[in-house]
């Protein structure tokens, strides 16, 4: 008789990434009998919640329920009803909420309280809402990309799943850029670390990994821009800020109260003789780059080598996956190709930043002006962070792979987080069975 496939026992999981600028809901699925295999979990849906990050709801917490409705209803549609009760839901908040907690633990808890109340109204199995640490964000991002790239798999393949996958088991480093923080995580060549705060030890699938990680709070692209503006307005002679990081002809009024709202600008805060100032773009990459470099304190390092601000950074090792805003920005600028050298990227950025604002608006008519206006800064910031902050060079630039998705799953911390919380990454290598017993009869 012919082999007949049995209906597969599929499991689902939901993770909400409550970032500083927005919230995204991810739905994952996997075959139940292969829970401990590597690479079997994949993303089936991403739903971007309309509106800003949850930390912005601190004065209107009653709106959080409505804010989450569309994406939670989407999850209800995507996941079969019979699976709803069994489906775990996790919410992890990142640097936007870390910043809010720095200002007021009570306010941060109030937001999370309302999040739990809202999510408990759905038929899923809500597991918890919390602010994840920067270390976790880095570590889970590293786990995600290496899981998806098959780096934890003991089976060597003669083929590659993705273009930049090499058949060796060397893990990729992870570079994550958000709105309010950025993370760098990799396995350094030297096992011993000068800074225990930046050291993580994992045992995954029977192998030990000694991982370096650091999260730079306030160095996500949005907070870095606020920092730069707060720094530059200090020396402005009047309420006009001629800014090289914005296109020529671009104008925008900024409230000083908004500028000093975030803890990230506290170090630059001063009493100004005006309540508002106007940014006037002059579109000069080189000057923008110089201004950005002033955000990185490289004069002090209590270790053999530092990134910036006195934070230990071992010598870079191996290939890196750069995802989240690293990818979104570079993809918009059409600079994600493996063939584009660092020199070429710099050249393209010079050209892009110098383009008049009116011309840019016409060329990218479908893009929201708020986002469009910031790509010159963001691209420049990415280059500065990678080259001067993390010490990539023109040569090692080719080891950076700008990644959006790997085999249909977004690169980011959420998958690694769910794999960990559902105990789907075993410490030991599972015993392989020749045939999964429940697949065929």
């Amino acid at each position: 008789t012919q082999n007949k496939a049995l209906p597969e026992n599929i499991k689902y999981g939901i993770v909400l990434d409550a970032g500083s600028s927005h919230t995204s809901l991810y739905i994952y699925k996997w075959p139940a009998e292969k829970e401990n295999d590597t690479g079997v979990v994949h993303q089936v849906e991403e739903c971007r919640v309309k509106g800003p990050g949850i930390s912005k709801y601190v004065q209107k917490v009653n709106e959080i329920g409505i804010y989450l409705t569309d994406c939670m209803e989407r999850a209800r549609e995507v996941i079969p009803r019979s699976q709803h009760q069994e489906t775990p839901v996790y919410l992890g908040a990142t640097a936007g909420m870390r910043l809010l907690r720095m200002e007021s633990e009570e306010l941060a808890d109030r937001v999370l309280d309302v999040v739990e109340r809202s999510l408990s109204n759905y038929p899923f199995d809500f597991q918890g809402a919390r602010i994840i640490t920067g270390q976790e964000e880095g570590a889970y991002g590293w786990i995600t990309i290496n899981y998806l790239l098959g780096k934890f798999s003991q089976k060597t393949r003669w083929f590659s799943i993705v273009p930049y996958e090499t058949n060796n088991q060397e893990t990729f480093g992870a570079l994550d850029l958000g709105g309010a923080s950025t993370q760098i995580t990799f396995v350094p060549q030297n096992q011993t670390t000068e800074s225990p705060d930046n050291a993580l030890q994992f045992r995954l699938y029977g192998k030990d990994y000694n991982v370096y990680t650091h999260s730079f709070l306030c160095y996500g692209k949005d907070q870095a821009l606020w920092q730069k503006l707060a720094k530059d307005i200090q020396v402005a002679s009047n309420e006009i800020l001629r800014d090289p990081c914005f296109h020529p002809g671009y104008k925008k009024v900024v409230n000083v109260s908004d500028l000093y709202k975030t803890p990230c600008t506290k170090r630059f805060e001063m009493t100004l003789p005006f309540q508002q100032f106007e940014i006037q773009g002059i579109g000069n990459y080189q000057q923008c780059h110089q201004s950005v470099l002033e955000l990185f304190n490289t004069s002090y390092c209590p270790y053999s080598q530092c990134a910036f601000n006195g934070i230990f950074l071992p010598p870079l090792q191996g290939d890196f996956g750069a995802f989240s805003a690293f990818y979104f920005v570079m993809n918009f600028l059409n600079l994600t190709s493996e063939k584009v050298s660092q020199e070429k990227v710099t050249e393209m950025m010079k050209k892009f930043c110098s383009q008049p604002w009116e011309e840019i608006k016409t060329s990218y008519a479908g893009v929201k002006e708020k986002y469009l206006s910031e790509y010159c800064f963001s691209g420049t910031y990415i280059l500065s962070l990678l080259l001067q902050g993390y010490h990539f060079t023109a040569d090692s630039w080719e080891h950076i792979h700008f990644i959006g998705k790997i085999q249909g799953s977004d690169a980011g911390w959420t998958l690694g987080y769910m794999l960990n919380l559902t105990n789907m990454i075993p410490a030991e290598q599972p015993l392989s069975t020749p045939l999964s017993h429940s697949t065929y009869v």
């Epitope: 996790y90 808890d109 309280d113 739990e116 408990s120 199995d125 809500f126 597991q127 918890g128 919390r130």
Partner: nanobody, 126 residues
Framework: QVQLQESGGGLVQAGGSLRLACTVS????????MGWFRQAPGQERDFVTA????????HYADSVKGRFTISRDNAANTVYLQMNTLKPEDTAVYYC???????????????????WGQGTQVTVSS
């Protein structure tokens, strides 16, 4: 790792009330679902009730529904179990339990990694 300390146990007459408390040290309290389990002599440890990190989700064993109430005070890192209309069959050692990023429903199934308190004796006399 969180540490749990129960208090409030004792001897009470049938029909009476008792309030147990469990204080948690270390860890971020709101990240833990909290629960109460009980173990009568010669019996297995049984689920009584559990509550989510911010208190919006609760589960109760059928045997205590309507008589027992679980609550939590996140500012005080404490979970409470108010026991009313106590019966002799409620006599047991009551254990406080904490489970990180685990739903009350999973606690009920004793799934996930659970941290236990030392237990407090509750005796209901007839």
């Amino acid at each position: 790792q969180v540490q749990l300390q129960e208090s409030g146990g004792g001897l009470v007459q049938a029909g009476g009330s008792l309030r147990l408390a469990c204080t948690v040290s270390r860890g971020t309290f709101s990240e833990y679902s909290m629960g109460w389990f009980r173990q009568a002599p010669g019996q297995e440890r049984d689920f009584v009730t559990a509550i989510s990190g911010f208190g919006h989700i609760t589960h109760y064993a059928d045997s205590v529904k309507g008589r027992f109430t679980i609550s939590r005070d996140n500012a005080a890192n404490t979970v409470y179990l108010q026991m009313n209309t106590l019966k002799p069959e409620d006599t047991a050692v009551y254990y406080c339990a904490a489970a990180w990023q685990t739903s009350p429903r999973r606690m009920m199934q004793m799934a996930g990694s659970i941290t236990w308190g030392q237990g407090t004796q509750v005796t209901v006399s007839s």
